[in-house]
């Protein structure tokens, strides 16, 4: 057995969520590097006052630790600076961004492939530069969502060890050329750009050279601007159900939404014998309601000991600041014998009760449904 009855109305205060805390960035820095962490405001909106926290304790600004509302810099990093960093809303303590920072003895590329691309002694007396990992350079076009971290690599070798420089759109590329700067990891043959924005689009060329020759590789970066969308409901959920009198029924709705969705379970009801109000909008009662903090949510409605009055049309509705998605579904309640017969018919017909997915936009709704309180209901019964 699973859970018993749902509460009629469960409210929840809306909190503005930043980038999903689950998307924890794992970063590796070399000893002596400047650790730079960026936490842009969610959806590009105002950030509000924030606090930076390391391993659960608030960070105190100093000459070495530079704290801003969206950015944290730790200069001349050492092993002691390793740890779990987060940026939180000061008032709510809601975590906006998570970072796992590791500071190693040697400079590194800032990801899980540390050390793999370092220059190696090839044993060759002299030689022009060559690519050591050409198979890793196949992807010439990189398209990433805004606010992501981008790393371009040109792992190479030669004797003497070649130098590496970077061009953007054919011109010398330096840190001061972009807000947020860049990280050049010469030992890792890499260019790192954090929190990319549309202006970072372009062609990036690594030039690797020594006195015996020069090689180059060009990558194209496209930055995709995230366009928030109204919630999406998983097809086929919730499905229509037929239940026996006195049994328990459970419905499942799955919601996907970049922006925090307000999720509701609603039931169409009658007031004074009418299903719609004077203006033609349906009467509905809220069975359960809350704000989801995640980009995806599994929501369930459980009705215990159902009676005939629980039969009817229900809705799973998800709303964010972009729009609305909702799915209507039906519960039919019968006596034991009738229910058995209907289930047999359903099997023969091939899942008669599997409801078809229906996404309804705000415009399609034709006005808000009327929300009915328990007192407004005449002879309405809900568990």
């Amino acid at each position: 057995e699973s859970l018993g009855t749902e509460q009629r109305v469960v409210g929840r205060v809306a909190e503005v969520s930043g980038p999903e805390p689950s998307q924890q960035e794992q970063l590796v820095f070399g000893s002596g590097d400047a650790v730079e962490l960026s936490c842009p405001p969610p959806g590009g909106g105002p950030m509000g006052p924030t606090v930076w926290v390391k391993d659960g304790a608030g960070l105190v600004p100093s000459e070495r630790v530079l704290v801003g509302p969206q950015r944290l810099q730790v200069l001349n990093a050492s092993h002691e600076d390793s740890g779990a960093y987060s940026c939180r809303q000061r008032l709510t303590q809601l975590v906006l961004c998570h970072f796992s920072v590791r500071v190693t003895d040697a400079p590194s590329s800032g990801d899980d492939e540390d050390g793999e691309d370092e220059a190696e002694d090839t044993g060759v007396d002299t030689g022009a530069p060559y690519w050591t990992r050409p198979e890793r350079m196949d992807k010439k076009l990189l398209a990433v969502p805004a606010a992501n971290t981008v790393r371009f690599r040109c792992p190479a070798a030669g004797n003497p060890t070649p130098s590496i420089s970077w061009l953007k759109n054919g011109k010398e590329f330096r840190g001061e050329h972009r807000i947020g700067g860049i990280k050049l990891r010469h030992q890792q043959w890499s260019l790192v750009m954090e929190s990319v924005v549309p202006s970072d689009r372009g062609n990036y060329t690594c030039v690797v050279e020594n006195k015996f020759g020069s090689i180059r590789q060009t990558y194209t970066l496209d930055v995709l601007e995230r366009s928030p969308h109204r919630p999406i409901l998983q097809a086929g959920l919730p499905a229509n159900q037929t239940a026996v009198l006195g049994s328990d029924v459970e419905f499942h709705c799955k919601v996907y939404s970049d922006a925090q969705p307000h999720i509701q379970w609603l039931k169409h009801v009658e007031v004074n014998g009418s299903k719609v109000g004077p203006d033609g909008t349906p009467y509905v009662t809220v069975l359960k309601s809350w704000i989801s903090e995640s980009v995806e949510a599994d929501v369930r409605l459980r009705l215990a000991n159902v009676s005939e009055r629980d039969g009817g049309e229900y809705l799973c509705r998800a709303t964010n600041f972009i729009g609305v998605a909702e799915k209507a579904f039906w519960l039919s309640v019968h006596g034991p014998r009738a229910a058995e017969e209907e289930l047999v018919e359903a099997d023969e017909a091939g899942s008669v009760y599997a409801g078809e997915q229906k996404l309804i936009s705000e415009e399609d709704l034709g006005g808000e449904q009327k929300l009915i309180s328990e007192e407004d209901l005449h002879h309405h019964h809900h568990h």
């Epitope: 509460q7 469960v10 369930r300």
Partner: antibody
Framework: EVQLVESGGGLVQPGGSLRLSCIVS????????MSWLRQAPGKGLEWISY????????YYADSVKGRFTISRDSAKNSLYLEMNSLRAEDTAIYYC????????????WGQGTLVTVSS | DIQMTQSPSSLSASVGDRVTITCRAS??????LNWYQQKPGKAPKLLIY???SLQSGVPSRFSGSGSGTDFTLTISSLQPEDFATYYC??????????FGQGTRLEIK
């Protein structure tokens, strides 16, 4: 009948690794969010990790972040917890749990598997 | 993070007694509060969810109440099998999911 059965616990030295598994039955695994919780000897309950039904959303407690990795395989009806860089304070009974829904309780628990980190 | 504080930490009572355990959240959690029972050597078991809803199969002598920050678990008439440790847990704001420190209920 809903069942969750953990395995993979044992004795490991500090700095070592272990992989816990949880095989579930009696419900549609791919429709439920799952979590790992633990309980140190004589102590209270501590939530350590969460994974959404699709596996796309993952959360960790600060105490294990960067060391533990949660994953799931719906084809095998299995939940996993990869534990690296283990410390003495990770010694505990580890429980695999089902979360009823996104704002709901842990309605079913496994029997637990003991992890001992000691030299 | 939302902190959960249970009181008392331990409690001695006799069979037939009415017992109350309280749980306080550091900020409002609406009705997103669950209660669990744990017996020695066993996994915890869900008793009450959403502050006041009785989990299927749990005896009706267990009840829960409260909303916002203050919650109560009540056992109306203590039975021998009720001697255990009880935990409250909030599921309002995640992560992290947080528990109270537990209340140990012992035989007087």
């Amino acid at each position: 009948e809903v069942q969750l059965v953990e395995s993979g616990g044992g004795l490991v030295q500090p700095g070592g690794s272990l992989r816990l598994s949880c095989i579930v039955s009696g419900f549609i695994f791919s429709s439920y969010e799952m979590s790992w919780l633990r309980q140190a000897p004589g102590k209270g309950l501590e939530w350590i990790s969460y994974i959404s039904s699709s596996g796309r959303v993952i959360y960790y407690a600060d105490s294990v972040k960067g060391r533990f990795t949660i994953s799931r395989d719906s084809a095998k009806n299995s939940l996993y917890l990869e534990m690296n860089s283990l410390r003495a304070e990770d010694t505990a009974i580890y429980y695999c749990t089902r979360k009823w829904d996104s704002s709901g309780p842990f309605d079913f628990w496994g029997q637990g598997t003991l992890v001992t980190v000691s030299s | 993070d939302i902190q959960m504080t249970q009181s008392p930490s331990s409690l001695s009572a006799s069979v037939g007694d009415r017992v109350t355990i309280t749980c306080r959240a550091s900020q409002s959690i609406s009705s997103y509060l669950n209660w669990y029972q744990q017996k020695p050597g066993k996994a915890p078991k869900l008793l009450i969810y959403a502050a006041s809803s009785l989990q299927s199969g749990v005896p009706s002598r267990f009840s829960g109440s409260g909303s916002g920050t203050d919650f109560t678990l009540t056992i109306s008439s203590l039975q021998p099998e009720d001697f255990a440790t009880y935990y409250c847990q909030q599921s309002y704001s995640t992560p992290p999911i947080t528990f109270g420190q537990g209340t140990r209920l012992e035989i007087k």
